[in-house]
């Protein structure tokens, strides 16, 4: 992948749009199809005041931890769906798209050099544990996915891409 492909805002917007479409397809978060068990996901709420003051290395840690947990969550949802008696085709399609999207985004971030930010010297303070929450519907899962992309991921890539432009 070209090193700065993720710096083209249209790339991230495409994945955000896919996640929002998936959320809409699941017919609302109150009455939509439920997960047979609760799944742990990252808390996507961004404290903008705190985020702006974080070093880019700290932001990278939050983004990588979030991406990792989100990938696990969607794979878990895929497994739950596979074990259900009659999984809706559209739901399977959106789960597959989300898994593919997360893999692509992970690759694009690696190419951007974001993983280098994680190599902190041994004497640095360990990162605060990732805040998490649980979801019980596919709609909520897709909403978390969309919010993570348009929140922490977008803010982080924006900062890294801006630095690279200088």
């Amino acid at each position: 992948a070209p090193p700065r492909l993720i710096c083209d805002s249209r790339v991230l917007e495409r994945y955000i749009l896919e996640a929002k479409e998936a959320e809409n397809v699941t017919m609302g978060c109150a009455e939509g199809p439920r997960l047979s068990e609760n799944i742990t996901v990252p808390d996507t709420k961004v404290n903008f005041y705190a985020w702006k003051r974080m070093e880019v290395e700290e932001q990278a840690i939050e983004v990588w931890q979030g991406l990792s947990l989100l990938s696990e969550a969607i794979l878990q949802a895929q497994a739950l769906l596979a074990n259900s008696s009659q999984p809706p085709e559209t739901l399977q399609l959106h789960i597959d798209k989300a898994i593919s999207g997360l893999r692509s985004l992970t690759s694009l971030l690696r190419v951007l050099g974001a993983q280098k930010e994680l190599m902190s010297p041994p004497d640095t303070t360990p990162p605060a544990p990732l805040r998490t929450l649980t979801v019980d519907t596919f709609c909520k899962l897709f909403r978390v996915y969309a919010n993570f992309l348009r929140g922490k991921l977008k803010l982080y890539t924006g900062e890294v891409c801006r630095r690279g432009d200088r």
């Epitope: 996507t44 709420k45 961004v46 404290n47 903008f48 005041y49 705190a50 702006k52 003051r53 909403r143 919010n147 348009r150 929140g151 977008k154 803010l155 924006g158």
Partner: antibody
Framework: QVQLVQSGAEVKKPGASVKVSCKAS????????MSWVRQAPGQGLEWMGW????????NYAQKFQGRVTMTRDTSISTAYMELSRLRSEDTAVYYC?????????WGQGTLVTVSS | SYELTQPLSVSVALGQTARITCSGD??????VYWYQQKPGQAPVLVIY???KRPSGIPERFSGSNSGNTATLTISRAQAGDEADYYC???????????FGGGTKLTVLG
């Protein structure tokens, strides 16, 4: 104590520019972002933009893009907000506000009157 | 761009509970801040991170947030609570802060 002291009231003609200053004291100026918020008479609060005093980078509300410029002078711990091409609707009290975990410290406000 | 909508005014009887709402698309997915402003004064924060109180703010002030509505609740309303109240959050699409239009709280009696 921690405080933000703003420059005095201004009267300007339409089309002119105004530059409001905000002097910080009692804390490390470069450790906190600074936002500017305005309030027209009898109206609500309107966020205009922020500046990072350490690096000088800024982000402006869409509404003010192209008309507002936020700068700082770290040597005197002062932030500035300049608004150009003034119109009568720009008549307002302009506040600087320090960003801690929220807008925790506010200046006393500067009344800018735009009148022909 | 992201918008926050508040009722223009809310009235409450002295000693009763006032609720001020702030509506915005999926605001439940964001942190919300509430500011109190009295005439001729700069705003003062009463709730941050949706439901936390800064030191010096009475326990009577609380906040909640779910779905498309955030709420500031003032229990046992006092005459001194009369003020304008503003909710605030941010627009992640532009990395900008957003204020609601403000609500004038009147304490009757």
């Amino acid at each position: 104590q921690v405080q933000l002291v703003q420059s005095g009231a201004e009267v300007k003609k339409p089309g002119a520019s105004v530059k409001v200053s905000c002097k910080a004291s009692g804390y490390t100026f470069t450790s906190y972002y600074m936002s500017w918020v305005r309030q027209a008479p009898g109206q609500g609060l309107e966020w205009m933009g922020w500046i990072n005093p350490l690096k000088g980078n800024t982000n402006y509300a869409q509404k003010f893009q192209g008309r507002v410029t936020m700068t700082r002078d770290t040597s005197i711990s002062t932030a500035y907000m300049e608004l150009s091409r003034l119109r009568s609707e720009d008549t307002a009290v302009y506040y600087c506000a320090r960003e801690g975990m929220y807008f925790d410290i506010w200046g006393q406000g500067t009344l800018v009157t735009v009148s022909s | 761009s992201y918008e926050l909508t508040q009722p223009l005014s809310v009235s409450v009887a002295l000693g009763q509970t006032a609720r001020i709402t702030c509506s915005g698309d999926s605001i439940g997915d964001k942190y919300v801040y509430w500011y109190q402003q009295k005439p001729g004064q700069a705003p003062v924060l009463v709730i941050y991170d949706t439901n936390k109180r800064p030191s010096g703010i009475p326990e009577r002030f609380s906040g909640s947030n779910s779905g498309n509505t955030a709420t500031l609740t003032i229990s046992r309303a006092q005459a001194g609570d009369e003020a304008d109240y503003y909710c605030q959050s941010w627009d992640l699409d532009f990395n900008t802060y957003v204020f609601g239009g403000g609500t004038k709280l009147t304490v009757l009696g």
